[in-house]
Interface confidence: low
């Protein structure tokens, strides 16, 4: 029996075309993705193939301004058309809370959502009830599959779950459930979740009747033979783990943003054991048209976008520097106010222990790309920001040692006067240079600020200690010479979109004046 | 109803710049590439370039790419093309045109200005 | 870039008859099921008016008189029972790949 698996993960709100690099589509007949392009893809494969599953790994939400305006509604009314039948949890389903998953997405899906490792408690424990799952039997032809759900237990210091949701460990989780399944006679097992290639795997080899693994968080292109675009193949694909019990089980995943649609077609044998499995992601290109319903669609809920864009969405009384000649040579504000949104987007229910798991940021100056007038009557507006974080990024979290942010800090000066992008700017850092020493040893002081303490104040960095750090994905990609952040970093959680969290934060302050306070100070 | 209504005549010398400008009502400025558009006198038309004033992304003739310049004011819905260098041969009429659809689907010019005629001479 | 051909040069017709004016691309400007050319007419002291889009579709406040066909290189614009107000300059323009290009013009005089 033949089963073709079509799976996506970590769309993050890009439900238009897209550029190859998945910012915004400028030249369509250049374009990717969206979904009247995949909707045209899925199509096809349901019509040519008897057995199709169409499943969406997680992190539907966040990315793009769609999400901003229409905050998982849009997830709720394309998946529903495009009809998906499962989609798992991913961290970013929580960033407006639990309220801003159960009302747009979990009460309108006509698809299961799926999570087993997620426990609700107190008064949410009923209010959330049957809207998510830990797993779904589904019919396909005439046999059943059984999918069942994990989400990352870092969640609740990469998003907002709140503190009734408890995420437990993926494969302590996900045993009890697979087991109940073997004991309703199904057979054939897809783990369908969102917690990244090196825990797809550990849950491919650990956990008892798992046919096959479909995964997202990582962002991990797979791909066997000439991978058609730009993305370099982290593994074949399938990647094929043995398990502890001795299985071959193929672990996929789709890279991002909707580029490609995975694409795996597994074949069992009448005891549900898997016989063989084989495919490639599809890149999702111009070659294939946008199917025009949904084209029709998407540009019917684009409008309310576009007035979106113009609306005011705060007020700032001072000039918000933002120009090439401060940020690249000096602390400025602009620096200051992306880094105190970024962190202030990364407040997290704490322990007593600490009052926040983060507390730094470092920002490439190269990537301000613009001030911000206060003279037009201070009114600071999504088009604004988008001329000032122009290039759709994110603000991601990583664990890197203190002698990497030390190295990071000596690379934000080593060619310093040349108006270059790689300056650092910084929140919860006091750094101090001095010029006249050679590159590589021009950090005279870099002190942080403290985590683990209930009134925060700035101590020395420690070289051995790991320390978490929001950034742009930029820099966690290595870019603007930041090799060192690339090859040492310890961790790695994508974030929310820049210009999402700038404008949050000037919604939720209303009135900003950020000042340039000596953050960063020449000896 | 949409609007393209663009700055009047211009007589420049050899050498001289040239900014024409083209004010659009009736629309959702920020949503729709604006196109620039030249015909020279008893000629055919000639793609100049383009801009999305929403992120200010443009696209360049190769042809022009040196002497051009095209840029929007989000306040004002106006949209500027700037042309260096000026030689005789660059008299013409220039059009601004906005492309219809909501994404960049087509690209089709579906309202056009009523043209600038650039007179260029010693 | 791609260069757009129009023939003829000049169509001279009576009210009534039937205009067929072909553009052909240097190379395909379709891709699966899309056809990125388009048709527009000019007349003198005027800007050009959008006939058709994608090869086939009537741009609304065209009459149903204009039509367009074709597909990959070869596209044709059809004026059916043509009348005295439709003598112009009719131009197609591709929008396939960058730079857009312009076919260079079809004159059409009616007698």
């Known amino acids: 029996w033949e089963l073709t698996i079509l799976h996506t993960n970590d769309v993050h709100s890009r439900l238009e075309q897209t550029s190859e690099d998945s910012s915004k589509c400028v030249n369509a007949s250049r374009c990717m993705g969206g979904v009247a392009r995949l909707f045209t893809k899925v199509q096809q494969i349901r019509r040519a193939e008897p057995n199709v599953l169409l499943l969406d790994a997680g992190d539907q939400y966040q990315g793009t301004i769609w999400f901003t305006v229409y905050k998982g509604a849009e997830v709720a009314h394309f998946m529903n058309a495009l009809r998906y039948d499962a989609m798992a949890l991913g961290n970013h389903e929580f960033d407006n809370g639990v309220e801003g998953l159960i009302e747009p997405l979990l009460k309108e899906a006509k698809f299961p959502i799926l999570s087993a490792n997620i426990k609700a408690k107190g008064p949410l424990a009923s209010q959330i009830s049957g809207l998510y799952l830990p797993y779904k039997v589904l019919p396909v032809g005439d046999e059943v599959v059984g999918i069942v759900g994990y989400t990352s237990k870092e969640t609740p210091f990469l998003s907002n779950p709140g503190t009734n949701l408890v995420f437990e460990d993926e494969i302590t989780a996900l045993q009890p459930e697979v087991d109940k399944l073997k004991t309703l006679n199904v057979n054939k097992i897809i783990a369908l979740g969102h917690s990244g290639f090196e825990t797809d795997k550990l849950i491919a080899q650990k956990v008892r009747g798992v046919d096959v693994v479909v995964g997202g968080h990582s962002n991990t292109f797979l791909y066997t033979g000439n991978p058609p675009s730009k993305e370099v193949p982290a593994g074949k694909y399938p990647f094929i783990v043995t398990s502890d019990d001795g299985r071959k089980v193929p672990v996929v995943q789709a890279y991002a943003f909707g580029k490609y649609l995975g694409y795996l077609k597994i074949e069992f044998d009448e005891r549900g054991n898997v016989i063989s499995s084989h495919g490639n992601p599809i890149l999702l290109n111009s070659s294939i048209p946008e199917d025009p319903s949904i084209k029709a669609d998407i540009n019917k809920w684009r409008i309310k976008l576009d007035n979106y864009s113009t609306q005011e969405l705060g007020k700032t009384i001072v000039y918000l520097d933002g120009s090439s000649q401060s940020c690249r040579f000096r602390e400025c504000n602009m620096g200051n106010l992306i880094c105190d949104a970024m962190i202030n987007n990364n407040l997290r229910h704490a322990d007593e222990m600490f009052w926040n798991h983060v507390s730094m940021c470092i920002l490439n100056g190269g990537g301000i790309r613009s001030p911000i007038d206060e003279r037009n009557n201070g009114t600071i507006t999504w088009e604004n920001l988008a001329a000032v974080l122009p290039f759709g990024g994110t603000f991601d979290l990583v664990q890197l040692k203190g002698s990497t942010l030390k190295k990071a800090f000596e690379h934000s000066v080593h060619r310093y006067g040349q108006s270059t992008g790689e300056f650092l700017q910084v929140g919860g850092i006091h750094v101090v240079y001095d010029l006249s020493r050679k590159p590589g040893d021009r950090v005279v002081k870099l002190d942080v600020l403290c985590t683990k303490c209930r009134v925060p104040s700035y101590d020395p960095l420690k070289m051995d200690e790991i320390y978490k750090v929001i950034l742009p994905n930029f820099l966690a990609n290595g870019g603007d010479g930041f090799q060192m952040i690339k090859d040492e970093l310890l961790r790695h959680d994508s974030g929310d979109q820049d210009i999402n969290v700038v404008s949050t934060y000037i919604s939720k302050m209303k009135v900003i004046y950020p000042a340039v306070e000596g953050r960063i100070k020449f000896s | 109803q949409v609007q393209l209504v663009q700055s009047g005549a211009e007589v420049e010398k050899p050498g001289a710049s040239v900014k024409v400008s083209c004010k659009a009502s009736g629309y959702t400025f920020t949503s729709y590439w604006i196109t620039w558009v030249r015909q020279a006198p008893g000629q055919g038309l000639e793609w100049m370039g383009d801009?999305?004033?929403?992120?200010?992304?443009?696209n360049y003739n190769e042809k022009f790419k040196t002497r051009v310049t095209i840029t929007a004011d989000k306040s004002t819905s106006t949209a500027y093309m700037e042309l260096s260098s000026l030689r005789s041969e660059d008299t013409a009429v220039y059009y601004c045109?906005?492309?219809?659809?909501?994404?960049?689907?087509?690209?089709?010019?579906?309202?056009w200005g009523q043209g600038t005629l650039v007179t260029v001479s010693s | 870039e791609i260069v757009l051909t129009q023939s003829p040069a000049t169509l001279s017709l009576s009210p009534g008859e039937r205009a067929t004016l072909s553009c052909r691309a240097s190379k395909n400007v379709s891709t699966s099921g899309y056809s990125y050319m388009h048709w527009y007419q000019q007349k003198p002291g005027q800007a050009p008016r959008l006939l058709i889009y994608l090869a086939s579709n009537l741009e609304s406040g065209i009459p149903p008189r204009f039509s367009g066909s074709g597909y990959g290189t070869d596209f044709t614009l059809t004026i059916n029972n043509i009348e005295s107000e439709d003598a112009a300059y009719y131009f197609c323009?591709?929008?396939?790949?960058?730079?857009?290009?312009f076919g260079q013009g079809t004159k059409v005089e009616i007698k």
């Open positions: 801009i999305y004033p929403g992120s200010g992304n443009t």
């Open positions: 323009q591709h929008s396939r790949e960058l730079p857009f290009t």
């Open positions: 045109a906005k492309e219809g659809g909501l994404t960049t689907e087509d690209y089709a010019l579906d309202y």
